[in-house]
């Protein structure tokens, strides 16, 4: 069964800057990745970035840089300032779509005990939805 992992890290140099990394552990080809915050994509969350493997990337503030790391993983840097800045308990969600086979989504937040700039290796997060 495919899985999605999510890793959230606060940058040591900029405490209002977050990096979200997400990956897909499965054999299917990815047709679209969406990153949201405040809840799952389609369930009250707000889309921060959308990445298409061939057609490009769209992003919205406070997203600063979204990019593909591999064919099945992405990263997103958020630059917080003012009302739109993320806080330590913000939930971030990544949804990997493989049209028309299905979509898989998982969420994560900053670990409570994490030091800025330090993070554990990514581990699979629970799958919240599989269409």
């Amino acid at each position: 069964t495919p899985e999605v992992w999510v890793q959230v890290r606060m940058e040591a140099t900029e405490l209002s800057s977050f990096t979200i990394r997400c990956g897909f552990l499965g054999s299917g080809s990815i047709s679209l990745v969406t990153v949201s915050w405040g809840g799952p994509n389609g369930a009250g969350g707000t889309t921060l970035a959308v990445l298409h493997p061939e057609r490009g990337i769209r992003q919205w503030a406070p997203a600063r840089q979204a990019r593909w790391e591999t064919q099945s993983s992405i990263s997103l840097i958020l630059e917080g300032s003012g009302a739109s800045s993320p806080c330590a308990n913000t939930t971030f969600c990544c949804k990997f779509a493989s049209f028309p086979e299905g979509s898989w989504e998982a969420c994560g937040s900053l670990p409570p005990s994490s030091d800025p700039g330090l993070s554990a290796p990514p581990t699979p997060a629970p799958i919240l939805r599989a269409d």
């Epitope: 969406t34 707000t46 298409h52 057609r55 049209f99």
Partner: nanobody, 120 residues
Framework: EVQLVESGGGLVQPGGSLRLSCAAS????????MGWFRQAPGKGLEGVAH???????RYVESVKGRFTISRDNAKNSLYLQMNSLRAEDTAVYYC??????????????WGQGTMVTVSS
Amino acid sequence: EVQLVESGGGLVQPGGSLRLSCAASGFTSRTDCMGWFRQAPGKGLEGVAHIDSDGIPRYVESVKGRFTISRDNAKNSLYLQMNSLRAEDTAVYYCVVGFKFGDYCAPNDWGQGTMVTVSS
């Protein structure tokens, strides 16, 4: 959670008409297109038509003048009127909601699909 439910597929003779409907509930923030894709037996996916947030319909060349896409915002519904159907229109048709990349509507959510068979 986003749910898209298609209806209206079936068997029709060449030259006939069908109207596909898609009932939508829920939404994903910042999606800006809604449309129809199809997959013919043994073939790849093809974007048939979509409507951008500006309300402008766009069609793949092979259906221009024969298919008409429309939406009813009050009913959260999308439609595809298909006229002058041909055997090559036989496919599973999927209703999608997605994000625009140029003239392409990248599916983020989709329905289970409805089968359209054009045969005499």
